[in-house]
């Protein structure tokens, strides 16, 4: 279930996917990947509000008892709904090697 | 990749599963709902330092860049890593019928 | 915006070489590798290999090992690509194409046509 | 190498028809898997990468399909400008490979 996308903070204050530009030094990579060397990291930001992208019924019950005790109860958090492969061409003993990984950039987001 | 399990920030203040007693009045379910009058919620709550419990390379990337850039990124958010179905009993037009809910109680905890 | 530029069409004779160039703009250039590719007139695509264009290593195609040299310029971000005792059947356009961090590549140069013959 | 056979090698189809292309791949390849078109005299365009994922830019008439080993792209409802042969191609491992295209060609 994925309920409302309209977000009642103002556009683009919800979760929702962004994108951050790092380099291999900023992920700590440096040494073992050949490419690419800089990264458009996509990544789930954004606040949740009530019922704001609820990912499942647990994310509706969360918002329900936050409101009721915010001091035990965080609210929910936004995070990848999926991901995007990524392919790294990396150093290995033998030489360079490609490899993908299926679960470092996210491709869409809710709130859970 | 489960990373740490070791909290540094003391016993207990980390990602972790708690139970949280609620009324169906709580949850807003009191007028479809006829069984269980009250739901121990199993939530995953905590904080997430740096690699405790990472889920994926995402996560990894997540401590990674709002150690850097901690007004942008986020730190990593605890949330279900799984679920343990729950059955209702709820009230139908034509009577009742048992129900269960494959996504409402967490069953295990990681930082995403 | 991303830019792969590549030198003229060449004519050569069996068993001499070519070296083919791919000149890049709008972008960080030591930040990806550079594969090229090649397709015989009328046939399908064939990957030659791969260069990194921040360290120089290399990946190349098995039956193409010990003809093909791949190399890179960062001071004026161009890949170079050559290839040796060449035979009729290396008749071809050959592409250079920009990795990117998704696998496929939209990014490829306009190709160079190299004609082998006698 | 991981062989890459596409189906049919030929394809009419009239204008506003659906075409169904077909990759196989002689092991799996995941979802790392991209689609091109090529037109006569230009380089290849990308169309999807991750198996079913739109490159920029790409009209939603086209979509993939597919994991493992059996892949497909779609397009649901072909334009004039759709004629052209297409390519699909695995990036699991080196060496990368291609398969052998599919012309779709007016009916």
């Known amino acids: 279930a994925r309920n409302g996308d309209h977000c009642p903070l103002g556009p683009g204050r919800c979760c929702r996917l962004h994108t951050v530009r790092a380099s291999l030094e900023d992920l700590g990579w440096a040494d073992w990947v050949l490419s690419p060397r800089e990264v458009q990291v996509t990544m789930c930001i954004g606040a949740c509000p009530s019922q704001f992208r609820a990912a499942n019924m647990h994310a509706q019950i969360k918002t329900s008892l936050h409101r009721l005790k915010p001091d035990t109860v965080p609210a929910p958090c936004c995070v990848p709904a999926s991901y995007n492969p990524m392919v790294l061409i990396q150093k290995t003993d033998t030489g360079v090697s490609l490899q993908t990984y299926d679960d470092l950039l996210a491709k869409d987001c809710h709130c859970i | 990749a489960r990373n740490g399990d070791h909290c540094p920030l003391g016993p207990g203040r980390c990602c972790r599963l708690h139970t949280v007693r609620a009324s169906l009045e709580d949850l807003g379910w009191a007028d479809w709902v006829l069984s269980p009058r009250e739901v121990q919620v199993t939530m995953c709550i905590g904080a997430c330092p740096s690699q405790f419990r990472a889920a994926n390379m995402h996560a990894q990337i997540k401590t990674s860049l709002h150690r850097l850039k901690p007004d942008t990124v986020p730190a990593p958010c605890c949330v279900p890593a799984s679920y343990n179905p729950m059955v209702l009993i709820q009230k139908t037009d034509t009577g009742v019928s048992l129900q269960t809910y494959d996504d409402l109680l967490a069953k295990d905890c990681h930082c995403i | 915006q991303v830019q792969l530029v590549q030198s003229g069409a060449e004519v050569k004779k069996p068993g001499a070489s070519v070296k083919v160039s791919c000149k890049a703009s709008g972008y960080t250039f030591d930040s990806y590798g550079i594969n090229w590719v090649r397709q015989a007139p009328g046939q399908g695509l064939e990957w030659m290999g791969w260069?990194?264009?921040?360290?120089?290593?290399?990946a190349y195609a098995q039956e193409l090992q010990g003809r093909v040299t791949m190399t890179t310029d960062t001071s004026t971000s161009t890949a170079y690509m050559e290839l040796r005792s060449l035979r009729s059947d290396d008749t071809a356009v050959y592409y250079c194409?920009?990795?990117?961090?998704?696998?496929?590549?939209?990014?490829w140069g306009q190709g160079t046509l190299v004609t082998v013959s006698s | 190498e991981i062989v890459m056979t596409q189906s049919p090698a030929t394809l009419s189809v009239s204008p506003g028809e659906r075409a169904t292309l077909s990759c196989r791949a002689s092991?799996?390849?995941?979802?790392?898997l991209a689609w091109y078109q090529q037109k006569p005299g230009q380089a290849p365009r990308l169309l999807i990468y991750g198996a079913s994922t739109r490159a920029t830019g790409i009209p939603a008439r086209f979509s993939g399909s597919g994991s493992g080993t059996e892949f497909t792209l779609t397009i649901s409802s072909l334009q004039s400008e759709d004629f052209a042969v297409y390519y699909c191609?695995?990036?699991?491992?080196?060496?990368?490979?291609f398969g052998g295209g599919t012309k779709v060609e007016i009916k």
């Open positions: 260069i990194s264009a921040y360290s120089g290593d290399t």
């Open positions: 194409v920009r990795d990117t961090q998704y696998g496929g590549s939209p990014y």
């Open positions: 092991q799996s390849v995941s979802s790392n």
């Open positions: 191609q695995q990036y699991n491992n080196w060496p990368i490979t």
